[in-house]
């Protein structure tokens, strides 16, 4: 099949001590080979601070995964979402103030 | 082969602006951050502030918050340092570097030297 | 701002001879942030070793990187010429980022 750009939706949820959980959301993408990893200043975190989904097909010939970290609160427009796929890429903010999500089709 | 290409050195007067240009190659553009230091004559690095070429965010050390303004041209693949109210104590060589995958400055400019003086 | 002090200022030693840089922070940090540089006389720094230990593409095994928490440490196992220059250690855990004030590893 031809190449289908993920839609990226990151959202961020409390939790507690000062700290949030932010998740990068991509799906409806396809091929299923897709990078995602949570940025702090553009430097990818390391593997053991971030939790990943599998890449799971989402019922429409394409798919979905997901990946997540904590970060302090306050520090939000520190980190980004890095995607590649296909040859695109692209990085995706945290949401600030009372946003908490924000998607992104990749064209 | 990444590299990062500078501009030419300048000499500035006290109260001026000064801008800097960075051309990076080698990947794309957009992909990674672009760091600003500076390092005055013998002295140590001072970071000013990184911009994400994709999205345009900008962080900027507070100090130099008020004075400083990075940019990015999409378009030509170049990122730019501006600094305003310019004193003889920026005399500075201006380095820009590339955010890495596991450090924030994997690749260097060659620098551009900043003299300010009247 | 996380102050990171390194020492001593200079160090002084002959080729062969074994090179131990500190880098002592005024907060810990993780070790995923601390990294290290080498800047030669009229150049552009280098990295040298990123998040304490891991050695950065094409860095002679000569060079090593180890610590933790608050107390960072640079090794070069036995000194080549081309060894010797400033190098500065960079955290970047907190903002602003910050970097050390250098070591000058000199020919004695």
């Known amino acids: 099949g031809s190449t289908v750009p993920p839609m990226v939706n990151v959202t961020c949820s409390e939790v507690s001590e000062g700290n949030i959980t932010v998740t990068c959301r991509a799906s409806s993408f396809y091929p299923r080979n897709i990078t995602l990893t949570w940025r702090q200043d553009g430097v990818s975190l390391s593997h053991n601070t971030q939790q990943w989904g599998d890449v799971l097909p989402d019922g429409n010939g394409t798919y979905q995964t997901w990946v997540a970290t904590r970060i302090r609160q306050g520090e939000e427009q520190r980190f980004t979402c890095y995607m590649e796929h296909s040859g695109n890429h692209g990085t995706h903010p945290v949401p600030s103030g009372n946003s908490h999500h924000h998607h992104h089709h990749h064209h | 082969e990444i590299q990062l290409v500078q501009s030419g050195a300048e000499v500035k007067k006290p109260g001026a602006s000064v801008k800097v240009s960075c051309k990076p190659s080698?990947?794309?553009?957009?992909?990674?951050?672009i760091y600003w230091v500076r390092q005055a004559p013998g002295q140590g690095l001072e970071w000013i502030g990184y911009?994400?070429?994709?999205?345009?965010?900008?962080i900027y050390n507070q100090q130099f918050k008020d004075r400083a303004t990075l940019t990015v041209d999409k378009s030509t693949s170049t990122a730019y340092l501006e600094l305003s109210s310019l004193r003889s104590e920026d005399t500075a060589v201006y380095y820009c570097?590339?955010?890495?995958?596991?450090?924030?400055?994997?690749?260097w400019g060659q620098g551009t030297l900043v003299t300010v003086s009247s | 701002e996380i102050v990171l002090t390194q020492s001593p200022a200079t160090l002084s030693l002959s080729p062969g001879e074994r090179a131990t840089l500190s880098c002592s922070a005024s907060?810990?940090?993780?070790?995923?942030?601390l990294h290290w540089y080498q800047q030669k006389p009229g150049q552009s720094p280098r990295l040298l070793i990123y998040?304490?230990?891991n050695l950065a593409s094409g860095v002679p095994a000569r060079f090593s990187g180890s610590g933790s928490g608050t107390d960072y440490t640079l090794t070069i196992s036995s000194l080549e010429p081309e060894d010797f220059a400033v190098y500065y250690c960079?955290?970047?855990?907190?903002?602003?980022?910050?970097f050390g004030q250098g070591t000058k590893v000199e020919i004695k």
């Open positions: 570097s590339r955010s890495g995958e596991r450090s924030n400055f994997d690749y």
């Open positions: 080698g990947y794309a553009f957009t992909s990674n951050n």
């Open positions: 911009i994400d070429p994709y999205i345009g965010r900008i």
């Open positions: 907060s810990s940090i993780s070790s995923n942030y």
């Open positions: 998040r304490t230990s």
């Open positions: 960079q955290q970047g855990g907190s903002l602003p980022l910050t």
